[in-house]
């Protein structure tokens, strides 16, 4: 089995607890992989304001994960 690594995770630190819904352009979920041993929720902000990592344990992240999974499966 490949060793799980933290070194290539996209998120640095634990992530913010919430992002204003009005500021969200899109949400991406990165599932644990060879590169990173944790789930990452990355929010792309509107108006070219970049991206933010959302704390995957936060209420907002859990809602987004649920919504995305419902859409995909």
């Amino acid at each position: 089995f490949p060793m799980f690594k933290r070194g290539r995770c996209l998120c640095i630190g634990p992530g913010v607890k919430a992002v204003k819904v009005a500021d969200i352009e899109k949400a991406s979920i990165m599932y644990p992989s060879n590169n990173c041993d944790k789930i990452e929720v990355i929010i792309t902000l509107k108006e070219n304001k970049g991206q933010r990592c959302l704390n995957p344990k936060s209420k907002q992240a859990r809602l987004i994960i649920k919504k995305v999974e419902r859409k995909n499966f």
Epitope: R6, C9, L10, C11, I12, G13, P14, G15, V16, K17, V19, I42, I43, K49, G50, Q51, R52, C53, L54, N55
Partner: nanobody, 129 residues
Framework: EVQLVESGGGLVQAGGSLRLSCAAS????????MGWFRQTPGKDREFVAV???????????EYADSVKGRFTISRDNAKNTAYLQMNSLKFEDTAVYYC???????????????????WGQGTQVTVSS
Amino acid sequence: EVQLVESGGGLVQAGGSLRLSCAASGGTFTKQTMGWFRQTPGKDREFVAVQWWTGLSTYSAEYADSVKGRFTISRDNAKNTAYLQMNSLKFEDTAVYYCAAGLGVVRTFIRRASSYDDWGQGTQVTVSS
């Protein structure tokens, strides 16, 4: 939200040293990604240095090429303070220096000012030649 207050700026001769401090209050400091940026009139904020929590009670750091080997970023979690030790200062280091904090920084955008949520008011550093 974290409140940040910088101090330690001033006037120094080329070749001299300064240590900037950034005192944080109102949030979890340990896991904050702490960045230093600088700005000169009419220009965008320029990345200087960043230090982030690796999740293993240790920190990693990254520096702009222009300051590598001269500047060192560090922190004292007990004091909720980040530092920027600046040695061998050059005339071109003259700028207003800002510290920034973020919990949700994406690695790809670590050098981008828009990645940080909270900012200090800035401290002026002037290097005379």
